[in-house]
């Protein structure tokens, strides 16, 4: 039950995290105009990974995409790549983890397969989270580096921009969303990896034990998870790991009250 809960929670946390990474990647507020000297401004600038925006006092907001690819700073391209890799890995991880969930039955999938899938998705979530954290951190570092510079803005040279008095930029909301989302995805991945340990038996210490229930011969084979009988017996079978015993529900295709969280 604890394994199912850990796996389910890991999935949910990762799902929230990946949704956050997607949101952060799409957000326009990666960097916002520094208002330290002028808290209320008639023209407010903010920039994202894909476009820059200007909000006027009039209430109008104008956003312009970065239509150049070669003219963009390498760091910005790297951040884009990291975020996209994070999203792709996270999405694949989610897909894999759905099939790996203990509470979902898909045909006659073995627990060993589910354990492997859980581990795979967990690793994917960890890498996804690290990609997002790295991407956001690289961008944050870029902002800090550019903050005190007196040349135009941080994308000088992009699209033949004219040199102007610098508008200083500071951390935008997307950075915080990205950091939190990356952290959640990472935590979710770790939880999936922990859940995997509970799902998979350690083959080397596995004891082949034969049990005799009234009328049926129920035997566990080394390396297998399923009882040799095809009957829906209520007999509790003990699986032995590291010499310790735990009671688990008999693995049958019939749902029980423990099958769903």
């Amino acid at each position: 039950m604890a394994v199912t809960a850990c796996q389910g929670l890991g999935f949910v946390v990762s799902l929230i995290g990946i949704a956050g990474i997607i949101a952060a990647t799409c957000m326009d507020q990666w960097s916002t105009q520094d208002l330290y000297n002028n808290p209320v401004t008639a023209v407010f600038n903010y920039q994202g990974l894909w476009r820059s925006c200007v909000r006027e006092s009039s209430g109008f907001t104008e956003c312009r995409g970065y239509f150049t690819l070669l003219g963009l700073p390498a760091m910005l391209q790297a951040v884009r790549a990291l975020m996209i890799v994070g999203i792709v890995l996270g999405a694949i991880g989610l897909l894999v983890s759905i099939f790996a969930l203990k509470c979902i039955r898909i045909g006659s999938m073995e627990d060993s397969a589910k354990a492997n899938m859980t581990l795979t998705s967990g690793i994917m979530f960890i890498v996804s989270g690290l990609c997002a954290i790295a991407g956001v951190s690289v961008f944050a570092n870029m902002l800090v580096t550019n903050f005190w510079m007196s040349t135009a803005n941080m994308y000088t040279g992009m699209g033949g921009m004219v040199q102007t008095v610098q508008t200083r930029y500071t951390f935008g909301a997307a950075l915080f969303v990205g950091w939190v989302a990356g952290g959640l995805t990472l935590i979710g991945g770790v939880m999936m990896c922990i859940a995997c340990r509970g799902l998979a038996p350690e083959e080397t210490n596995y004891k082949a034990v034969s049990y005799h229930a009234s009328g049926h011969s129920v035997a566990y084979k080394p390396g297998g998870f399923k009882a040799s009988t095809g009957f829906g017996s209520n007999t509790k079978n003990k699986k032995i790991y590291d010499g310790g015993a735990r009671t688990e529900d008999e693995v049958q295709s019939y749902p029980s009250k423990h099958d769903y969280v």
């Epitope: 002028n38 008639a42 023209v43 006027e56 006092s57 009039s58 209430g59 102007t164 008095v165």
Partner: antibody
């Protein structure tokens, strides 16, 4: 057709307060920021401040800070500018103006004359 | 505060002639975010409220005759009336729309010669 209809002329004693209204029609009142501009007799234009009718947010020129209050009533599409502790140099025509692209004021009211005798 | 300085104070031009009004700001009005200059030109005739002519330094307001044009960037701006008409006699104001407080120039009075 966009129209900004301002309240009538006022004569006030020094130290009193005046509240000028500006009723908007022909457009979405909450979609455009409203500005207030002062023009003393024979003088140029002076920006007093603005109000965002959508959320009631305001920004005032330092010179008028503490004496001016801008409010709005979205149910009747009307913006208000109240100027307190009136002085003789407050004698002027007060305009309300709608702000559009580029923070430019594209539509103006006819103006409200406020007279404060010395 | 950004100070707007207009020149000349008054200008007398013959009908059909070109009229040029200058405006200088104490700080750049060019916004790096969209590469637009937040400078506006207004025309005011006696007893009337101001009328918007040009915004973003060079974008003509709809309904404004094409004889009116705006140019300049950063701190130096110009309003040009290519062929003066009798109805163009008025006071012209430039305005900083970039930074609070929004400030106006003192105005340039355009008259017929």
């Amino acid at each position: 057709e966009v129209q900004l209809q301002q309240s009538g002329a006022e004569v006030k004693k020094p130290g009193a307060s005046v509240k000028v209204s500006c009723k908007a029609s022909g457009y979405s009142f909450t979609g455009y920021t409203m500005n207030w501009v002062k023009q003393a007799p024979g003088q140029g234009l002076e920006w007093i401040g603005l109000i965002n009718p959508y959320n009631g947010g305001t920004s005032y020129a330092q010179k008028f800070q503490g004496r001016v209050t801008m409010t709005r009533d979205t149910s009747i599409s009307t913006a208000y500018m109240e100027l307190s502790r009136l002085r003789s140099d407050d004698t002027a025509v007060y305009y309300c103006a709608r702000m559009n692209y580029g923070n430019a004021m594209d539509y103006w009211g006819a103006g409200t004359t406020v007279t404060v005798p010395s | 505060d950004i100070v707007m300085t207009q020149s000349p104070d008054s200008l007398a031009v013959s009908l059909g002639e070109r009229a040029t009004i200058n405006c200088k700001s104490s700080q750049s009005l060019l916004n790096s975010g969209n590469q637009k200059n937040y400078l506006t030109w207004y025309q005011q005739k006696p007893g009337q409220p101001p009328k918007l002519l040009i915004y973003w330094a060079s974008t003509r307001e709809s309904g404004v005759p094409d004889r009116f044009s705006g140019s300049g960037s950063g701190t130096d701006f110009t309003l040009t009336i290519s062929s003066l008409q009798a109805e163009d006699v008025a006071v012209y104001y430039c305005q900083n729309d970039y930074s609070y407080p929004l400030t106006f120039g003192a105005g340039t009075k355009l008259e017929l010669k």
